[in-house]
């Protein structure tokens, strides 16, 4: 059975520009090293938002300057993207790669449409 990656269809970012979603994969093998990448698709252009490699049983670690954080539990990854603004609205795709041991396997989710609404500025109070 091929590797399947599931993620929610739609997520609404919080007023603070934070969006969280779960990326879950059905693994065809017993991977010990997994790479998770978040891709953003907008206007048919695909760009990498963030990526992290983790050892099964260990924590997911993104680079210090990454806008992503996450935790892992078995074949499930909880992803959080912060610092989002209205212009960042788009389809966020979860890509999972089983890196080790060989063989390598690839799985790509259908994407989560993240809607970001910039907060209205507070009116001045007298």
């Amino acid at each position: 059975k091929a590797m399947h990656v599931a993620q929610p269809a739609v997520v609404l970012a919080s007023s603070r520009g934070i969006a969280s979603f779960v990326c879950e994969y059905a693994s065809p093998g017993k991977a010990t090293e997994v790479r998770v990448t978040v891709l953003r698709q907008a206007d048919s252009q695909v760009t990498e938002v963030c990526a992290a490699t983790y050892m099964m049983g260990n924590e997911l670690t993104f680079l210090d300057d990454s806008i992503c954080t996450g935790t892992s539990s078995g074949n499930q990854v909880n992803l959080t993207i912060q610092g989002l603004r209205a212009m960042d609205t788009g389809l966020y795709i979860c890509k999972v790669e089983l890196m080790y041991p060989p063989p390598y396997y690839l799985g790509i989710g259908n994407g989560t449409q993240i809607y970001v609404i910039d907060p209205e500025p507070c009116p001045d109070s007298d």
Epitope: A2, M99, I108
Partner: antibody, heavy 111, light 103 residues
Framework: GVVQPGRSLRLSCAAS????????MHWVRQAPGKGLEWVAV????????YYADSVKGRFTISRDNSKNTLYLQMNSLRAEDTAVYYC?????????????WGQGTTVTVSS | TQSPSSLSASVGDRVTITCRAS??????LNWYQQKPGKAPKFLIY???ILQSGVPSGFSASGSGPDFTLTISSLQPEDFATYYC?????????FGPGTKVDIK
């Protein structure tokens, strides 16, 4: 180049026009009059390498990101390794989809 | 496997090439075009997504194990050999190719 069976050869592929250190890179070969055969891939940072069974243990893929160069060290060469060897860039979304290809270099293994 | 291994067609013809995977590779199939003496050109990835710059006359579909590449109206520059390739798992194997030549 022409090389005798059992000997070694190193291929180089100098990349330009893109951020080399951000992409996985592949070697693909094509024997005369035959189809394409995937040979090896190396991840953007050199952390992972995978090989076709036909070259495993004989060929080594490597890269030098400071020189924007991909290498293929070929040892214990055989007549069946005679082919045009292409380097190719892995795509962002699908690392094994090769979206940019080099012009190819011919390797002939013959005594 | 790819079928047919070769076909003869005329300019304006609709051409369909089939690729069958020997294992479940989900949607992870790519298509390439190669002309004699030239490097392959990347056409399609993840079964149906056209690479930017590829003419809209090319389309593809499928999900393991059967995939198809269609050229809606064959142009003179489309006479070439077409290869499918799976990108789901190592080794990243290519199909044997389909040669499209002039009738």
């Amino acid at each position: 180049g022409v090389v005798q069976p059992g000997r070694s050869l190193r291929l180089s592929c100098a990349a330009s026009g893109f951020t080399f250190s951000s992409y996985g890179m592949h070697w693909v070969r094509q024997a005369p009059g035959k189809g394409l055969e995937w040979v090896a891939v190396i991840w953007y940072d050199g952390s992972h390498k995978y090989y076709a069974d036909s070259v495993k243990g004989r060929f080594t893929i490597s890269r030098d990101n400071s020189k924007n160069t991909l290498y293929l060290q070929m040892n214990s060469l055989r007549a069946e390794d005679t082919a045009v060897y292409y380097c190719a860039r892995g795509a962002v979304v699908v690392p094994a989809a090769m979206d940019v290809w080099g012009q190819g270099t011919t390797v002939t293994v013959s005594s | 496997t790819q079928s047919p291994s070769s076909l003869s067609a005329s300019v304006g013809d609709r051409v369909t090439i089939t690729c069958r995977a020997s294992q479940n590779i989900s949607r992870y199939l790519n298509w390439y075009q190669q002309k004699p003496g030239k490097a392959p050109k990347f056409l399609i990835y993840v079964a149906s997504i056209l690479q930017s710059g590829v003419p809209s006359g090319f389309s593809a579909s499928g999900s393991g194990p059967d995939f198809t590449l269609t050229i809606s109206s064959l142009q003179p520059e489309d006479f070439a050999t077409y290869y499918c390739q799976q990108s789901y798992s190592t080794p990243f194997t290519f199909g044997p190719g389909t040669k499209v030549d002039i009738k």
